[in-house]
């Protein structure tokens, strides 16, 4: 069973996040400089004619792009997709961004720019001020704050109104750690490293980021092929050879926004035996409530039994018991020459009265915890109340 | 960069440490090897140390050696030293390339011990 | 334990020519395979990680190949400077150990 229960479907991770309904409100929304007061942050709003009808930076975006739109969700999204247009002014607006670049935050403090799948950064935007320009972010971004920093190629103005959509990021996860994936050499390389990590990548040990191992996207039976257009073999996945691991497992450590109960981990494997893929033998799961704190209470063990012999991707689900923890570390025992993972998520409940905790490494940011969920949230819903989500589909207009 | 220091002449049995000093990171994300030389021979791996504190030693240095760690030194103690002992001791510090793969990237310029009555 | 043991010991070829050095590890490695260059009172030289993978700022005139067992780092257009002894190593994230080396001699 290939089924990620209790996982996000990147698909329906579509919902406008409140630009243009208004339920971010002014307060969330800043800048670097403004034109004007009737240019200022609060009139980026896509659709608005707030003001003189946008976002305009007082500065020059040419050649420094040091300019930037600040939206903070007051707490972790997924973003999808993202969309702008530029000044309105009664229809008499002539300014708009014909690329803009983003970069994006969890924890206020460590700031990551944004880049698709083969590593460009920069955007295509609008035309004209008044079209709406959706971007299909590939990969897609979880974030509590996102910067826009419009571009030009010459001096002259540009403006900016936005809309981001996504959806509430339930599973808490902040970053993971783990070791660097590997190639596999078959008769062509099969690149299993985790392209999208944003984290640090160091000795061996990418940590501090999240990646392709939480991106919703599930791995096909074939490891070779991709859900994904123009990438290389391998895309999907992240892998490890047990050759270059003496003690005969891959480790990983799992940070979390706050304290949580964990009932499950779901993690989605290959198990293309016939090229050396296989399931993992067993897991093993430590928890601990603080970074600098102890491991608790006994590790949890699960050995893997089921159908090894066949050799299509699954999801494994490895009971944790309802540990309540903030850290996980698990180690994933070799049955094979190769781990294969696509996809890790949890399933856990947030125990009542635990204060976010951002980022074990930083101190807890000013402005944390927030205050109140956005009104169109509650703590069980992924997306708002009464929208439809932007659909995903050939022809629409996303770039 | 890396530099060992502690090399000198001792005496059979002696216990010695040498201390590798990592300058420009952290050594907590790094596995770090010892390696030695004898004069005139190859290189002998003796132990590496993990980013979580984990030890491998080669099967001949089990009970030899004891490597130990901070985020800036890497110690190596030699227990009860042998005139076979006598060698350049390097630290090392693994890495990985574009395949995903570790290899040593980065060397000290090695500490020579000589065991001798 | 692991034993990779390294073949010839030492070879000798001219300037220009190409020489080849066979590494062998007692059971299979995959693709966990490095190799260094020393020169003579010098720290070694990291070349190739990952069989293939060749480290920064080495020329392309090094080459390795090979899978499991079996192994080989290939020099061709050989030039003086290469003149140095050989390792190959096996490097997962733990027991690392070394081939006995080949000296390479150019003439």
């Known amino acids: 069973d290939a089924d990620m229960k209790g996982h996000f479907d990147p698909a329906k991770c579509r919902y406008a996040l409140g630009m243009q309904d208004r339920t971010i409100p002014d307060s969330d929304i800043s800048a670097s400089s403004s034109w004007s007061d009737s240019t200022a942050a609060r009139h980026s709003r896509l659709e608005s004619s707030d003001g003189d009808g946008a976002w305009c930076p007082a500065g020059s975006v040419f050649p420094k792009e040091e300019e930037y739109l600040q939206v903070d969700l007051q707490r972790l999204h997924l973003v999808a997709l993202v969309g702008t247009q530029g000044r309105h002014a009664g229809g008499l607006g002539k300014e708009f961004s014909r690329s803009y670049r983003l970069r994006y935050s969890r924890d206020g403090r460590r700031w990551m720019g944004w880049k698709d799948r083969w590593g460009q950064e920069v955007i295509s935007g609008n035309e004209d001020p008044e079209g709406v320009v959706l971007k299909d972010l590939g990969p897609p971004m979880v974030a509590r704050l996102v910067r826009f920093y419009p571009r030009a190629d010459r001096v002259m103005s540009v403006c900016l109104r936005v809309e981001l959509y996504g959806c509430l990021w339930r599973d808490g996860l902040l970053s993971y750690t783990a070791p660097v994936g590997q190639t596999m050499y078959l008769s062509e390389a099969v690149y299993l490293n985790d392209s999208t990590y944003d984290g640090h990548t160091v000795g061996g040990l990418q940590y501090g980021g999240l990646g392709q191992l939480a991106d919703g996207v599930v791995g096909l039976d074939d490891f070779r092929k991709s859900q994904e257009l123009r990438v290389w073999p391998g895309y999907d996945y992240v892998g490890w050879s047990n050759h270059s691991f003496s003690s005969g497992y891959v480790e990983m450590e799992f940070e979390f926004d706050r304290l949580r109960a964990f009932q499950a981990m779901q993690v989605h494997c290959n198990n293309m035996h016939t090229l050396g893929a296989r399931l993992p033998g067993g897991v093993e799961c430590r928890f601990r409530r603080g970074p600098a704190m102890a491991w608790e209470g006994e590790p949890m063990r699960h050995n893997l039994g089921g159908n090894l012999g066949d050799p299509r991707a699954r999801a494994v689900s490895v009971p944790l018991g309802g540990r309540v923890a903030r850290f996980l570390q698990c180690r994933f025992l070799f049955a094979g020459p190769w781990l294969l993972f696509s996809e890790i998520s949890f399933i856990s409940d947030v125990v009542n009265n635990s204060s976010p905790a951002l980022g074990g490494t930083f101190p807890p940011a000013p402005w944390w915890p927030p205050g109140p969920p956005p009104t169109n949230f509650s703590s069980l819903e992924l997306e708002p109340r009464g929208q439809q989500p932007v659909a995903k589909a050939e022809g629409s207009p996303t770039a | 960069s890396l530099e060992e220091s502690g090399g000198r002449l001792v005496t059979p049995g002696t216990p010695l440490t040498l201390t590798c000093t990592a300058s420009?990171?952290?050594?907590?994300?790094?596995?770090m090897l010892w390696v030695r030389q004898a004069p005139g021979e190859g290189l002998e791996w003796i132990g590496t140390i993990s980013y979580g504190d984990t030890t491998y030693y080669a099967s001949w240095a089990k009970g030899r050696f004891t490597i130990s760690k901070t985020s800036t030194t890497v110690d190596l103690k030699m227990t009860s030293p042998t005139t076979e002992d006598t060698a350049t001791y390097f630290c090392?510090?693994?890495?990985?390339?574009?395949?995903?793969?570790?290899?040593?990237?980065?060397w000290g310029p090695g500490t020579l011990v000589t065991v001798s009555s | 334990e692991l034993v990779m043991t390294q073949t010839p010991a030492s070879v000798e070829a001219a300037v220009g020519g190409t020489v080849t050095i066979k590494c062998q590890a007692s059971?299979?490695?995959?693709?966990?395979l490095a190799w260094y260059q020393q020169k003579p009172g010098q720290r070694p030289k990291l070349l190739i990680s990952?069989?293939?993978d060749l480290a920064s700022g080495v020329p392309s005139r090094f080459k390795g190949s090979g899978s499991g067992t079996e192994f080989t780092l290939t020099i061709s257009d050989l030039e003086c400077a290469d003149a140095a002894t050989y390792y190959c190593?096996?490097?997962?994230?733990?027991?690392?150990?070394f081939g006995g080396g080949t000296e390479v001699v150019v003439k």
């Open positions: 420009g990171f952290s050594l907590n994300r790094y596995y």
């Open positions: 090392a510090r693994a890495d990985t390339g574009d395949n995903g793969y570790l290899g040593l990237q980065l």
């Open positions: 190593q096996y490097i997962p994230y733990g027991s690392s150990p």
């Open positions: 990952g069989v293939f």
């Open positions: 059971q299979s490695i995959g693709s966990v």
